[in-house]
């Protein structure tokens, strides 16, 4: 065709995959009548008629474009819908009158790739490899045209470097005509790269301009030999008996070597291997003073069979031993003296305190408590507390009961009990003394004795209230080898209706169980007479 060499460059139309390309026929009125135009697609220099315009009416030719072409803009523009990568070619319109002229349009098609998918080499990379090893693979799917890949390490782009960095990219064409790009980064890494962040970036073009997508950042397992092994103890700081203590081996190599933890036997001075858990951690729970000693860790590289030993670490589990009080069960006559001595061992300086058990009152700061001119009130519990002031919570205590010889001491001398005839009354009587007294009652009934502590006893009596009992009252007698004492319970009849909350008496209620002689449960009130506690 004459004059073909002078043909102007085709007009460029850029469009994204799936959208509609508007192919505007650029013939001027002088070049041809737009009401009589043929449209061709050019592929590999072969033209194929795809559309005809006659008297302004369009008609698709049978073939791949048949369903996707339509006329717009009063016949000047051909619309191509559902653009695919295969549509990237030259389209031309040819006017027939007054003479045959052509207008060429270059259709460029674009498609952004999907987010790049990065996969790190799960096997990791040894630092001493002779040539670059596979670090990670980056895949960008379904882009068009082929995007460009750039690899980054710690935010800096990586360049090809002989024997150090090699980027190997390949692409495949999907049935859709889109490209999937695969890029493999190979590199020689050093120990410092164990924390390096790698990512890939896909650069691509759209009608709107240049764009890029970044993958997530990954770190690659870097394998390097162990140079140092050491022990770590948790918690840090002062340890005490009862704590949960973890001793673990650490190493600066990857993978870590096979660890074993040993403790020096204080007798033989030999290192004896300790049993660790599945994670190689020696858990001491609860820690005991016997766990104190010199620990060390051995790291064995199973590939090279090279063994490394940690610096030994001294572990001190602070303790307070069982507290011993002497005498352990003191018995004294009234008026005599008693010296209580408290002893304990500890890994730290100890402080001693003596407290009265019943009141919590601090009697002495120090290991020795001296009691003079003992009265019976001095009998009872004394507690020695041995503590380490520098370690909160590290203490042990021992309770000692001081027994003062004496006849029974009654909880009350006399007591008035309000009762109803025919009820079963539950009476109680308490006495203390050393030796521990026994209690008897002057009436028949069901009695049971309960030891409250080594010097105190409580007796309860279930008895039926009869007229005779109302007349005589009830006595309980406590006795031991040193004497006897009696408490009297006066029984007084009362109507249950008089037991109202606004009653002006001040003693508590004692519950009594109804016997077969009464129709319902009844309650009796025990009322103390206003006099001091009897002292025997």
């Amino acid at each position: 065709v004459p004059g073909e060499a002078e043909q102007p460059a085709p007009e460029l139309v850029e469009v994204e995959v799936g959208s509609t390309a508007l192919l505007k026929c650029g013939l001027s009125q002088s070049q041809g009548n737009l009401s009589h135009v043929d449209w061709f697609s050019v592929h590999k220099e072969k033209r194929t008629l795809i559309f005809r315009v006659r008297q302004g009416q369009g008609q698709s030719e049978p073939g791949e474009y048949e369903q996707r072409l339509s006329l717009q803009d009063r016949g000047a523009t051909l619309a191509l819908t559902q653009v695919t990568p295969q549509d990237e070619r030259i389209f031309l319109c040819q006017g027939k009158r007054p003479r045959s002229q052509e207008y060429r349009i270059q259709l460029r098609v674009y498609k952004a790739p999907e987010e790049p998918n990065i996969q790190v080499n799960p096997l990791g990379i040894p630092v001493n490899s002779k040539e670059p090893e596979e670090v990670a693979t980056c895949v960008g799917r379904n882009g068009y045209p082929i995007p460009q890949v750039i690899w980054y390490k710690n935010g800096r782009p990586l360049k090809e470097e002989k024997n150090r960095v090699h980027i190997q990219s390949s692409q495949t064409v999907e049935s859709s005509g889109l490209y999937t790009l695969q890029s493999i980064l190979k590199a020689q890494l050093v120990k410092e790269d164990k924390d390096a962040q790698f990512y890939c970036e896909l650069n691509y073009r759209l009608p709107s301009g240049n764009h890029m997508k970044e993958s997530r950042e990954v770190t690659v397992p870097v394998f390097y030999p162990t140079e140092k092994v050491w022990l770590e103890v948790e918690p840090v700081g002062m340890l005490k008996e009862g704590d949960r203590v973890e001793i673990r081996c650490l190493a600066d190599g990857n993978p870590p070597p096979h660890f074993s933890i040993s403790k020096q036997n204080p007798s033989t001075r030999e290192a004896e291997e300790e049993t660790t858990n599945d994670n190689g951690v020696l858990v001491l729970e609860p820690a005991r003073k016997e766990h104190s000693g010199r620990y060390e860790c051995q790291g064995l590289d199973l590939d090279t069979m090279i063994s490394l030993l940690s610096e030994p670490q001294e572990l001190l589990v602070n303790y307070v031993s069982d507290v011993r009080v002497s005498p352990a069960a003191p018995e004294r006559q009234e008026g005599s003296s008693l010296t209580l001595t408290c002893e304990a061992e500890s890994s730290q300086d100890l402080e001693f305190q003596w407290l009265r058990e019943e009141t919590g009152q601090v009697l002495e700061r120090g290991p020795v408590l001296q009691l003079h001119d003992l009265k019976r009130e001095a009998g009872g519990g004394y507690r020695c507390v041995a503590s380490v002031p520098s370690i909160p919570g590290l203490n042990r205590t021992q309770l000692v009961n001081v027994a003062i010889f004496g006849p029974p001491w009654m909880a009350f001398k006399e007591r008035k009990v309000w009762v109803k005839e025919n009820m079963v009354l539950n009476l109680s009587c308490e006495a203390s003394g050393h030796p521990r007294p026994t209690i008897s009652w002057n009436v028949n009934g069901t009695a049971s004795e309960q030891d409250q502590d080594p010097q105190r006893v409580l007796s309860t009596l279930n008895v039926l209230v009869t007229p005779e009992l109302l007349e005589t009252g009830v006595e309980c007698t406590a006795s031991n080898d040193l004497g006897k004492n009696t408490s009297i319970l006066f029984l007084e009849l009362v109507n249950l209706t008089t037991l109202t909350p606004d009653s002006n008496t001040t003693t508590g209620l004692s519950t009594s169980t109804a016997s077969p002689h009464t129709r319902a449960n009844s309650t009796s009130t025990e009322r103390k007479l206003p006099e001091p506690e009897s002292r025997g």
Partner: antibody, heavy 118, light 111 residues
């Protein structure tokens, strides 16, 4: 030093009586309990009775009630065990022992042998 | 009466051994933290000697290799490292109530 010394043992015919003595020294006699414990040859220990010299209160093992009697002489710091109607099975070493109010025996005499035999 | 059962009745051991003797009472001999159980050692031809009182307290002058433990009905006398002078018969005794009773004894012999 604290000491208990038994005496009065010997060979006696069945049905006869014997009085054992226990002399205390080195402690306040009336502040402690004195017990008798016996041990038949090759056998274990058996508690017999106790007395509190301060009040003269006594307790007996039911097994010996009626036949054995405890008494004391505070001026001599001595305790006595009167044994009547003796039987062959009463043959034993008789120990006196001291206790406080928790009834463990912290001081023992060396024992005196009683043999009941015809 | 409370019956005291000691086990074993006899035991052979060597110097340096750790030995444990147990005593079981037919009912509890403990009251509010106090256990009325005591241990004695007796050598042939001699009077018994108090070792442990109130279950776990070492009598003055008794070597610390002797220890006692337990509460309620089950009690243990332990000798941590047998010495030649420890070969003897051992008795437990309760004082929870009258009559006081002893175990039948455990004879500890040299192996």
């Amino acid at each position: 030093q604290v000491q208990l010394v038994e005496s009065g043992g010997g060979v006696v015919q069945p049905g006869r009586s014997l009085r054992l003595s226990c002399a205390a020294s080195g402690f306040t006699f009336s502040n402690y309990w004195i017990h008798w414990v016996r041990q038949a040859p090759g056998k274990g220990l058996e508690w017999v009775a106790r007395i509190y010299p301060g009040t003269d209160i006594t307790y007996y093992n039911e097994k010996f009630k009626g036949r054995f009697t405890l008494s004391r002489d505070n001026s001599k710091n001595t305790l006595y065990l009167q044994m009547n109607s003796l039987r062959a099975e009463d043959t034993a070493v008789y120990y006196c022992a001291r206790s406080g109010g928790y009834w463990y025996f912290d001081v023992w005499g060396a024992g005196t042998m009683v043999t009941v035999s015809s | 009466d409370i019956v005291m059962t000691q086990s074993p009745s006899s035991l052979s051991a060597s110097v340096g051994d750790r030995v444990t003797i147990t005593c079981r009472a037919s009912k509890s001999v403990s009251i509010s933290g106090y256990s009325y159980m005591h241990w004695y050692q007796q050598k042939p031809g001699k009077a018994p000697k108090l070792l442990i009182y109130l279950a776990s307290n070492l009598e003055s002058g008794v070597p610390s290799r002797f220890s006692g433990s337990g509460s309620g009905t089950d009690f243990t006398l332990t000798i941590s490292s047998l010495q030649p002078e420890d070969f003897a018969t051992y008795y437990c005794q309760h004082s929870r109530e009258l009559p006081y009773t002893f175990g039948q004894g455990t004879k500890l012999e040299i192996k």
